[in-house]
Interface confidence: low
């Protein structure tokens, strides 16, 4: 028998420095977690203790804090090189700055293979990107070889900016021929490493013949065997065992997100490459693990350039700004209210006596709110805090939509409610009531909108045939998170201001903020 240790991360989202327990900015260092310096300590400890170790990343290193805002991926390449990652799969967020923003800072600089079998380049990009990412890589580990085959969510064109010259194929149909190829090369130990979410990870384990282990990402899934060490509630045991269609037991793992845990999986293979046993658990990277001094020093050196962004106070909050996915993807959250209020405020234009303002409505995908802000840091709100909340460098745009399109958008908001998906809408100038006992597509039971053609703003029922102005992220205007109806049916679209700038200007103007949860989004009795 031959034993392999798989160390894995996923959805790190630019958390190079240690963070608080909820993965926002570290306030009290003695209680902070994660960060690449601490990760390196644990990885080195395991490398010294165990013979056959692979360090893998399942994508979405990009996007999430000021580090990415400023360094645009160079930081990912630099610190992943320093940690000596063995392989990485492309995640959807690796395309947030377009293909060029992936090629130059990361693909050309990484000293480890970057993988995806289901992304195919076409047109002029094909030659430009050739060899910079691979469908699979065979890695020597001790006296053996291990095949790593990559995959990326085929939803990426809806979630990021890969452009028109990358084709995202179905994961399973793209993976199978690559795994077959590895088998013909006499590689009998194969890991599928990718970024399509836990459901797809399980399907890959079930359907792709020859895959021995699946290391996933995208859904921020926390798996744990035994008593979990922090706040995350396990979605299942670690590893999660899937019985494949050909009768094999295939371990599937994921390690939550934000570098808070290091996935740790020990696999025992027989001489024919079959998995005999698998066990392990994610390791919580808490303050009991010291930060590696050399990596920490490097972080501090790189940090200098960020300080201009991070030190300036924009204003204060006297309440917790709840930007957690547990809130903003499920119900009204006060961070969503704050952002929408800022978006409307930024568009105050008193041009006509018939209108108190030309626009009163805001919608915002809950998945676009990426972090909370803790008021206990003296209430201070900085640009860096906001960059963690709104890390995508988008704009808040003005569109004109028919009421019928808005109704479709709100149905889409809850069509698969409960799965922590990003399309759940936060709002401003809108009161919506959902009944989740009704079938998808028929769950909006009340939709009232704030009048604009009025002296005293009040809420009136949405009219299907009326044309409304709405402020929303450019991501939504472009059909992101499945809001194709907005892209297809908008009557006018005007680009707006940078998202962080809109919110920072609002906070600076207000000086002290205290957004509340105030009944903008409700669920009718019996359904929630």
């Amino acid at each position: 028998a031959w034993e392999l240790t798989i160390l894995h991360t996923n959805d790190v989202h630019s958390r190079l420095e240690q963070t608080s327990e909820d993965s926002s900015k570290c306030v009290n260092a003695s209680r902070c977690m994660g960060g690449v310096a601490r990760l390196f300590t644990k990885v080195q400890q395991i490398r010294r203790a165990e013979p056959n170790v692979l360090l893998l990343d399942a994508g979405d290193q990009y996007q999430g804090t000021i580090w990415f805002t400023v360094y645009k991926g160079a930081e990912v390449a630099h610190f992943m090189n320093a940690l000596r990652y063995d392989a990485m799969a492309l995640g959807n967020h690796e395309f947030d700055n377009g293909v060029e923003g992936l090629i130059e800072p990361l693909l050309k600089e990484a000293k480890f293979p970057i993988l995806s079998a289901n992304i195919k380049a076409k047109g002029p990009l094909a030659s430009q990107i050739s060899g910079l990412y691979l469908p699979y890589k065979v890695l020597p580990v001790g006296d053996e070889v291990v095949g790593i085959v990559g995959y990326t969510s085929k939803e990426t064109p809806f979630l990021s900016n890969p452009g028109t010259n990358l084709v995202f194929e179905d994961e399973i149909t793209a993976l199978q021929p690559e795994v077959d190829k590895l088998k013909t090369l006499n590689v009998n130990k194969i890991i599928a490493l990718g970024h399509s979410g836990f459901e797809m990870d399980k399907l890959i384990a079930q359907k792709v013949r020859g895959v021995d282990v699946v290391v996933g990402g995208h859904s921020n899934t926390f798996l744990y065997t035994g008593n979990p060490p922090s706040k995350e509630v396990p979605a299942g045991k670690y590893p999660f065992i899937v019985t494949s269609d050909d009768g094999r037991k295939v371990p599937v793992v994921q390690a939550y997100a934000f570098g808070k845990y290091l996935g740790y999986l020990k696999i025992e293979f027989d001489e024919r490459g079959n998995v005999i046993s698998s066990h392990g658990n994610p390791i919580l990277l808490n303050s009991s693990i010291p930060e590696d001094p050399s990596i920490k020093a490097d972080i501090n050196k790189w940090r200098i350039k960020l300080d201009n962004y991070s030190t300036q106070e924009l204003g204060k909050t006297i309440v917790y700004l709840d930007g957690s996915s547990q809130s903003c993807r499920f119900r009204e959250c006060n961070m969503g209210n704050l952002i929408c209020d800022a978006m409307i405020n930024n568009n105050l234009r008193h041009t006509d006596e018939m209108f108190w303002n030309h626009v009163s409505m805001c919608i915002l995908n809950g998945g676009g709110i990426r972090s909370p802000i803790d008021e206990r840091n003296n209430g201070t709100i900085t640009w860096e805090n906001l960059a963690a909340v709104l890390p995508f460098g988008g704009t808040f745009d003005l569109v004109q939509l028919k009421g019928s399109t808005l109704k479709k958008a709100f149905e889409h908001s809850v069509h698969r409610y409960g799965q922590s998906t990003g399309e759940f809408l936060q709002v401003g100038g809108i009161h919506v009531v959902y009944d989740l006992s009704r079938k998808p597509g028929d769950r909006v039971v009340k939709l009232d909108v704030l009048c604009t053609k009025c002296r005293v703003p009040s809420y009136d029922p949405l009219k299907m045939d009326e044309v409304y102005k709405v402020i929303l992220p450019n991501f939504l205007a472009n059909g992101g998170d499945g809001f194709q109806m907005i892209k297809d049916e908008l009557l006018r679209h005007d680009s707006g201001d940078q998202d962080i700038n809109v919110v920072s200007t609002y906070i600076s103007k207000m000086k002290v903020i205290y957004p509340a949860v105030e009944g903008r989004i409700k669920f009718s009795t019996g359904s929630h």
Partner: antibody, heavy 122, light 107 residues
């Protein structure tokens, strides 16, 4: 087995509207885009547009904007096309065709309905 | 819009003969091209997609080739059931556009 069953022939008067259907079976309706194609008697094929039943997103050939309206009903796995203000130029056979794929995004119109014949005559 | 120029518009061929139909796009369509066969009174049947990929169940005597602007459909050995009209379709850009068709008849 994948099947696209289209509604029967229509004889309509100029200026009227007609709504034809395309009932899908044998696959998950919301997972595939549905295209519509026009073929005038003795002539070639012309793309009208598509509907994505998953989110009702549509895309039209500019030539058919205002003429064709594409809708779908998830509960019955049926796609619809309504043609308005009919003239003799609209007399044709109209096909629905599923936009299928092999490896995710290598698409093609893989299954076709049998066609609905529309005759516009006073 | 991308114009698809198909040739010939009609042709006669003998059983067992090798037949080639071509389609030229007005711009590079990146191999996003399909071929269809239509028989009188029937709906089109998809033969080839992505320029050279054969649809499951289509006889191997059919093949597609080409890239850029120039594409062709070849029937290696013509059979009686291959008579009909053949169309190409580009799906690189909206609106999707078809060729005018090639009518294949028995000599």
């Amino acid at each position: 087995e994948v099947q696209l069953q289209q509604s029967g022939p229509e004889l309509v008067k100029p200026g009227a509207s007609v709504k034809m259907s395309c009932k899908a079976s044998g696959y998950t309706f919301t997972s595939y885009v549905m295209h519509w194609v026009k073929q005038k008697p003795g002539q070639g094929l012309e793309w009208i547009g598509y509907i994505n039943p998953y989110n009702d997103g549509t895309k039209y050939n500019e030539k058919f904007k205002g003429k064709a309206t594409l809708t779908s009903d998830k509960s019955s796995s049926t796609a619809y096309m309504e043609l308005s203000s009919l003239t003799s130029e609209d007399s044709a056979v109209y096909y629905c065709a599923r936009w299928g794929y092999d490896e995710g995004y290598y698409y093609a119109m893989d299954y076709w309905g049998q066609g609905t014949s529309v005759t516009v005559s006073s | 819009d991308i114009v698809m120029t198909q040739s010939p518009s009609s042709m006669y061929a003998s059983l067992g003969e090798r037949v080639t139909i071509t389609c030229k796009a007005s711009q590079d369509i990146n191999s996003y091209l399909s071929w269809f066969q239509q028989k009188p009174g029937k709906s089109p049947k998809t033969l080839i997609y992505r320029a050279n990929r054969l649809v499951d169940g289509v006889p191997s005597r059919f093949s597609g080739s080409g890239s850029g602007q120039d594409y062709s459909l070849t029937i290696s050995s013509l059979e009686y059931e291959d008579m009909g009209i053949y169309y190409c379709l580009q799906y690189d850009e909206f609106p999707l556009t078809f060729g005018a068709g090639t009518k294949l008849e028995l000599k």
